[in-house]
């Protein structure tokens, strides 16, 4: 056969669907690889062909669109399963072609089993809610296109294993779940089960997402440098190890890049000749506020090093701060027989 533009296996789109539920999978060609949509392609006389490779097999085979009750069907650029079966797992390929043009892409589809509490190997999206911030809501994801707007589905929400009536300041409102006030106790997995009729059959869609309650922008502050501070003086003798921690607290800020760095005499440690090492550790609070610690270490400090300026810097979307460490050379303790005796005028 003639050459086909093969985009390979698109592992970025690892599609996971639940067993025994409807699934609609759009051909990724039109979404991510080609500059035209299905309608344009169809109008130009191009045909969309589907085939698949079963799990642990190498053989590409056509998809059987003649199963009872049209269990698998194609509609425009969508491959439909009504419903899926566990052995539908495999790599699926959609190919767009005519006599002069060909383009194809493969993607993995995994049919996943869930238990009665909706636990499964499914990768869950995370939705962040601001703590004590007023009404916020989550929406049952990825249910568009499964039923027409004339169909009124029933939606049941669960937190973990339990059906949500109205509890813990949560109000179910159809496809939305409204949080009157988000608290740490609202952290967890939330599942919506959408039930709808189609051609005399009843289908269920199960969607689970993780809610994480995070710090509110109302409470966000610029970075706070806890160390170095004015109360601690790093007093060292030449030859000793100098260790200065820079500990910075960052309020949680959505999509903020938190940075901590040291300067020595106004330069980044990489730009000077001193043998400096910097180790960083990061910890998070329950609301994802962040504490970063960067420990500046000079194994054998020289008297020259003890005269330098060591400044810790921090930056977030809320602002930039800096604090100098108090570093000084330790004055050697007087040797009594010489210094002290001389002081008393002994000869």
């Amino acid at each position: 056969s003639e050459r086909c533009d093969d985009w390979g296996l698109d592992t970025m789109r690892q599609i996971q669907v639940f067993e025994d539920e409807p699934a609609r999978i759009k051909c990724p060609l039109f979404e991510h690889f080609l500059k035209f949509n299905y309608s344009t392609a169809h109008s130009a006389g191009l045909t969309l062909i589907w085939y698949w490779t079963r799990q642990d097999r190498d053989l590409e085979e056509p998809i059987n669109f003649r199963l009872p009750e049209n269990r698998i069907s194609k509609e425009k650029d969508v491959l439909w399963f009504r419903p899926t079966l566990l052995n539908d797992t495999g790599n699926y390929t959609c190919m767009l072609r005519n006599t002069t043009y060909c383009s194809k892409v493969a993607f993995p589809l995994e049919v996943v089993q869930k238990d009665s509490c909706f636990n499964s190997p499914m990768k869950l999206p995370v939705h962040k809610l601001y703590i004590e911030y007023g009404i916020q809501r989550i929406t049952c994801p990825n249910v568009d296109g499964y039923f027409p707007s004339s169909v009124k589905p029933t939606i049941t929400w669960y937190m973990g294993c339990y059906k949500i009536q109205n509890f813990n300041n949560v109000i179910p409102e159809g496809m939305n779940l409204s949080f009157l006030i988000a608290l740490i106790s609202n952290n967890g997995n939330y599942t919506c089960v959408v039930t709808y009729p189609e051609n005399g059959r009843t289908f269920h869609l199960t969607r689970t997402l993780t809610v994480k309650v995070v710090g509110s922008p109302k409470n966000a502050v610029p970075p706070v440098i806890h160390s170095p501070n004015d109360h601690v003086v790093y007093e060292k003798e030449p030859g000793e190890e100098l260790l200065i921690p820079c500990t910075v607290y960052f309020s949680f800020l959505m999509d903020s890049r938190n940075e901590v760095w040291w300067t020595i005499d106004g330069k980044k440690p990489d730009d000077i000749t001193i043998d400096v090492t910097i180790n960083e550790s990061i910890s998070h609070s329950r609301t994802e506020d962040e504490t970063r610690t960067q420990i500046l270490s000079i194994k054998k400090v020289t008297s020259e090093d003890l005269k330098r300026s060591y400044v810790c810097h921090a930056r977030s979307a809320k602002g930039e701060v800096a604090k100098a460490a108090k570093v000084k050379q330790k004055v050697p303790a007087p040797r009594y027989t010489v210094e002290l005796a001389c002081g008393f005028g002994a000869t």
């Epitope: 009404i135 809501r137 009536q165 109205n166 300041n169 109000i171």
Partner: antibody
Framework: QQLEQSGGGAEGGLVKPGGSLELCCKA??????????ICWVRQAPGKGLEWIGC?????????YYASWVNGRFTLSRDIDQSTGCLQLNSLTAADTAMYYC??????????????WGPGTLVTVSS | ALVMTQTPSPVSAAVGGTVTINCQAS??????LAWFQQKPGQPPKLLIY???TLASGVPSRFSGSGSGTEFTLTISALQSDDAATYYC?????????????FGGGTEVVVK
């Protein structure tokens, strides 16, 4: 488990137009700090019920108000006293009503206003 | 804003009969609706919450149904003690606001 209301005295609160009054609602037989909201509802003489607002009675103290309140009324709570209060300001004759407080248990249902206080009559007149 | 419309008012029925009160929401409130009974000189009393759940201590003669925008309170085997005004309460959230709205009330007269 009940709510006791105070404010304006047993004979009810008589206030001049433009005046202010604080109504309070004390929990008896349960602690407000547990996880409850206190909601306030008023009823003008011979008329229906009108929602004023709700306050989360624990340390968070979040509040929601009906749009018509327009900042004239303020909800507060005193955790130690297990009390929720409603401050009424810039009162007019149209604010003459029986003012009720009611508990909402969000672990139960947010439309379940239960129990209710006995109500305090507020009369605004010169 | 959410508006709750109650019909009819007043409504009358004989002892032992059945009364149906309707409540219509101006927008979808799903199942977030309660029914209250109020007698003269008393505070309201919760009968039904979440559209159809009977509150503790309320006789099973009271039942609620509906979801979305149309709701019904039914009182069967009517007793003289059921003479009162009945209110529905709808709950709806919007962006950062809560909207609780009562219906105008329906007076039930027992003959």
């Amino acid at each position: 488990q009940q709510l006791e209301q105070s404010g304006g005295g047993a004979e009810g609160g008589l206030v001049k137009p433009g005046g202010s009054l604080e109504l309070c609602c004390k929990a008896s037989g349960f602690s407000l700090t547990t996880n409850y909201w206190i909601c306030w509802v008023r009823q003008a003489p011979g008329k229906g019920l009108e929602w004023i607002g709700c306050i989360y009675a624990n340390s968070v103290g979040s509040t929601y108000y009906a749009s018509w309140v327009n900042g004239r009324f303020t909800l507060s709570r005193d955790i130690d006293q297990s009390t929720g209060c409603l401050q009424l300001n810039s009162l007019t004759a149209a604010d003459t009503a029986m003012y009720y407080c009611a508990r909402v248990d969000p672990g139960y249902s947010f439309d379940a206003f239960d129990p209710w206080g006995p109500g305090t009559l507020v009369t605004v007149s010169s | 804003a959410l508006v709750m419309t109650q019909t009819p008012s007043p409504v009358s029925a004989a002892v032992g009969g059945t009364v149906t009160i309707n409540c219509q929401a101006s927008e979808d409130i799903y199942s977030n609706l309660a029914w209250f009974q109020q007698k003269p000189g008393q505070p309201p009393k919760l009968l039904i919450y979440r559209a159809s759940t009977l509150a503790s201590g309320v006789p099973s003669r009271f039942s609620g149904s509906g979801s979305g925008t149309e709701f019904t309170l039914t009182i069967s085997a009517l007793q003289s003690d059921d003479a009162a005004t009945y209110y529905c309460l709808g709950v709806r959230t919007y962006f950062n606001t809560l909207n609780n709205s009562f219906g105008g009330g329906t007076e039930v007269v027992v003959k």
